[in-house]
């Protein structure tokens, strides 16, 4: 019966990779991640899923948690016990059957009339297995939500399995299997759906191909659409000159008209559903694209993209603090403190460490080339709209950074915020800046909830100083209309550029519809929905696509004119655009954290043939996308049947070994004396936590087979990375699975089903 099984390798980060213990998804599923040797039976955290990566099993260390591109799918609810059946068995007379007796011999299988039993024992109420997976719920949020960010959002509930909207388990209660747990549910789900034979390593989609040297590449602007108006020089005038608040000027300088400088507009959770997926991907004006956060969406996502130029060490420190302070859920805050969103994986996992140091604005007049670190955080607000304000309005600006030849590659030394999350530990390799001649531009598109309503959030350093984000030419919405699709400096595997519908900010996980295989920048369209192949309906997790513009200096230059001129004191610069003043540029560019909270994409309908197929799997080593399971299982691609889900994420056995992910620690800044600068060119610390979004039936993937999001961790590991190809059914809506593990289970099921489809 084995139908061709697609081999979707759902790349799951397993907590083990980070040394996290089993991740307990909030759901009953416990994904045991047996990092080495699945043989250890003890590793079962959650009843259902205990993602236990078996490092032994897979050549690559399964432990690697870093996921280049989490599929928006890893979402599952905890498994509920089914005790009855077992009990039923007990009820049965005990027939001693010799060992080895087969069911047939035992006469089992000869079920007495099912009529008698049909509803009976089988209907036994599920045990308390159902647990809302905090972490997972987070995952369900748009992919890319970072735990920290989310956690910071008190209002950001981890979305439990579909219905469990905001239920957020204590951060400690989050899936313990931070690595696999998140994904495990989806994986499991994929498999549950039909464990298609996933033989062989997960395939890497064409898009899955990682760019060579992506880890080291400093292709910060890969995501930037060259076509997008990014040419405007990052700075129009020194912020100080304007006398405006530093941010304002900076933003203004780089912002492209029509682009909310803020760039971070809370996106209602269901903005995707509300947003017509039909919105032209390329519309330049993004502000209108996003929904105002006021929308009824249960959660609003604020996509904060902080671009931090590389800054000198002394500044970097402040930035580090900034990252923490700026993000809701400052470093000190535990996942609990952070908010429901943290629960996702942080449950017990260490809270993501503060984002890498974000250098403070370089002293005025210093020509420190800064590669802005994009910190894109999508903060989803809980239905009540609460969310950490700081997260809401940051707009990432694109700033051209001239990389100094002599600078060592910058690598965040500190985990990006949320990186502490085992799942997310950033491992992006340090990216060496390209020759100074070619500025790297990381254009981050601020997520727009709507043209208005963008809240600017100023990230403040530990010192409380607001970091100024030097606006880089804001990418036209067309480039990244999607809030979720933040451009991540190179490093991230080329994310399929999906022309975001300008009107429709992708939820962080909503990428599925956006990146079309053919979309530029898309490595090959990879269908990512981890479970996609399997549950077409569920999980069009749209992975925030980190797009790094091509490294080619020319392209970067063309985008932004990089002036050797010292960056103006950004502190004094105020962005004049919109509320972007709050946008704080944090040097160190490269850290893009997209925190996607659960987006209610239930209303979103993707259209077939659209670019919803997010095949791009960021492979950028340093890009850690912690994707919380997006439960796309509900999303069935109506446009295409599961048959369409043949795409194998990563095109091949993509197993991400989280081991690779700790690049930050290893990476040394090469730029100037900014070695301490956490900024890693190419978005060195890019941590995209993608909350799995479960696309329930209301969400329709635009792609024929639903968005297939390939979760591709930068590192390929054998078992560790679940295949996350979940087809988001066009009808599926995004729903948070109770537990990330369950979500992973869902992914497994989807993968399994997908394999069968293969």
């Amino acid at each position: 019966m084995a139908e061709p099984r697609q081999e979707f390798e759902v790349m799951e980060d397993h907590a083990g990779t980070y040394g996290l213990g089993d991740r307990k998804d909030q759901g009953g599923y416990t994904m045991h991640q047996d990092q080495e040797g699945d043989t250890d039976a003890g590793l079962k955290e959650s009843p259902l899923q205990t993602p236990t990566e078996d490092g032994s099993e897979e050549p690559g260390s399964e432990t690697s948690d870093a996921k280049s591109t989490p599929t928006a799918e890893d979402v599952t609810a905890p498994l509920v016990d089914e005790g009855a059946p077992g009990k039923q068995a007990a009820a049965q007379p005990h027939t001693e059957i010799p060992e080895g007796t087969t069911a047939e011999e035992a006469g089992i299988g000869d079920t007495p009339s099912l009529e008698d039993e049909a509803a009976g024992h089988v209907t036994q109420e599920p045990e308390s297995g159902k647990v809302v997976q905090e972490g997972f719920l987070r995952e369900p949020g748009p992919p890319g939500l970072s735990h920290q960010l989310m956690s910071g959002m008190p209002g950001a509930p981890l979305l439990p399995e579909g219905p469990r909207e905001a239920t957020r388990q204590p951060s400690g209660t989050g899936p313990e299997d931070t690595e696999g747990g998140r994904h495990a549910p989806e994986l499991l789900k994929h498999q549950l759906l039909g464990d298609l034979h996933q033989e062989g390593p997960p395939l890497k989609g064409a898009g899955g191909k990682e760019r060579p040297g992506s880890k080291e590449e400093v292709d910060e602007d890969r995501d930037v659409d060259e076509s997008s108006p990014q040419d405007s020089p990052p700075s129009k005038a020194s912020p100080a000159q304007d006398g405006r608040p530093p941010q304002t000027a900076a933003r203004e300088a780089t912002s492209i008209p029509g682009f909310p400088a803020e760039g971070a507009i809370p996106l209602p959770v269901d903005f995707l559903s509300k947003v017509s997926t039909e919105i032209p991907a390329s519309e330049p004006d993004g502000p209108s694209v996003g929904r105002a956060k006021g929308q009824d969406a249960p959660l609003e996502f604020t996509f904060h993209v902080e671009i931090t130029p590389n800054v000198q060490k002394e500044q970097a420190h402040s930035e580090e603090h900034l990252g923490r302070a700026a993000f809701p859920g400052a470093p000190g805050e535990g996942p609990e403190a952070r908010g429901p969103s943290l629960g996702e994986d942080t449950k017990e996992a260490d809270l993501p460490e503060p984002s890498e140091k974000q250098p403070a604005a370089a002293p005025r007049g210093k020509p420190v080339s800064r590669v802005p670190q994009l910190k894109a955080r999508m903060v989803s607000k809980s239905k009540d709209g609460t969310g950490s304000d700081d997260k809401k309005a940051k707009t990432s600006t694109r700033s051209s950074a001239k990389t100094l030849k002599n600078r060592p590659c910058l690598s965040p030394k500190h985990p990006t915020p949320g990186s502490s999350d085992p799942l997310i530990q950033p491992s992006s390799p340090a990216v060496c800046p390209e020759p100074p001649s070619s500025p790297k531009y990381v254009s981050s598109v601020t997520s727009r909830t709507g043209s208005s309503g963008a809240k600017e959030m100023k990230l403040k350093g530990a010192d409380g100083k607001t970091k100024i984000a030097t606006p880089r030419g804001a990418a036209p919405p067309g480039q990244k209309g999607q809030a979720n699709a933040t451009r991540i400096p190179a490093k991230t595997p080329p994310a399929p550029k999906t022309p975001p519908s300008s009107g429709e900010p992708p939820k962080s996980g909503d990428r599925s519809g956006y990146s079309s295989p053919g979309s530029p920048g898309t490595p090959g369209s990879r269908s990512r929905t981890p479970s996609l192949p399997t549950p077409p309906t569920r999980e069009p997790k749209k992975v925030a696509v980190v797009r790094t513009p091509p490294k080619s200096p020319s392209s970067a230059k063309s985008r932004l004119q990089t002036a050797p001129v010292p960056m103006p004191d950004l502190k004094n610069v105020k962005s004049k655009i919109g509320s972007t003043e709050n946008l704080k540029h944090q040097p160190g560019g490269g850290k893009v954290q997209i925190i996607n909270k659960k987006l209610d994409l239930s209303n979103v309908q993707s259209k077939c043939g659209s670019k919803d197929n997010i095949k791009h799997v960021p492979g950028g080593g340093s890009v850690q996308i912690v994707y919380k399971p997006v439960d796309l299982s509900k999303v069935t691609s109506k446009c295409g049947s599961l048959g369409n889900i043949h795409h194998k994420p990563g095109g091949g056995q993509v197993e991400v070994k989280s081991e690779k992910l700790d690049f930050k620690d290893r990476v040394q800044s090469k730029i100037g004396s900014l070695d301490n600068i956490t900024h890693v060119p190419g978005g060195g610390n890019k941590k995209i936590e993608t909350h799995k979004l479960t696309f329930r039936e209301n969400a329709k993937a635009k792609t024929d087979h639903g968005a297939e999001i390939v979760y591709k961790s930068p590192v390929v590991s054998g078992d560790t990375s679940p295949r996350h190809l979940s087809n988001v059914s066009s009808t599926g809506s995004i729903d948070m699975v109770d537990s990330p593990q369950l979500a992973t289970l869902a992914d497994e099921v989807s993968a399994s089903l997908a394999k069968q489809g293969l």
Epitope: A2, H14, P51, Q198, E748, V749
Partner: antibody, heavy 116, light 110 residues
Amino acid sequence: QVQLQESGPSLVKPSQTLSLTCTVSGFSVISDSVAWVRQAPGKVPEWLGASGSSGNKYYNPALKSRLSITRDTSKSQVSLSLSSVTTEDTAVYYCARGIIAGVDVWGRGLLVSVSS
Amino acid sequence: QAVLTQPSSVSGALGQRVSITCSGSSSNVGYGDYVGWYQQVPGSAPKLLIYGAASRASGVPDRFSGSRSGNTATLTISSLQAEDEADYYCASYDSSDGGVFGSGTRLTVL
């Protein structure tokens, strides 16, 4: 050819641990998930858990506390360990490729009786 | 414990069209196309018929089809054959339970 074979004791005493091993062939436990399902005589199948291709283990919440699934990729085996068994655990235990909704290949099943 | 409810029995004449429903909730059947249908002949292991709610497993006659609408999945046998007499189970990924099977339906060919 894809095959799965359950092996282990057919008789286990109450309170003991039931340990079963599923040896697969024709596919890799690394690339495919292997689920454990049991079916008590005359009852409906019950999903016990699975070893995902990702290496993650998934358990039926109701059994998680007693259930452990491990995978030995080198041996192409997935093992199930159910502790503190009771007579209610008497059933035919199947290992199958897949997780739940798409378990396409099943082992023949091993009837395990829990009896003192 | 069967979370998924199926009619205990269904019968049909040869060549007749028969449908077996599987009702669940948003956490399982309604959760997505994570539904599978199994045919089990007494004494044998279940056989996968449909996976992903509507995809036929390899080797399964095309008379078997599956669909899912909301929280209900349906297995339809367009032209009942004598060999179709068996027990049919739906199974689904359950966000809370991981995997759940239906209560089972005994299909009788008249």
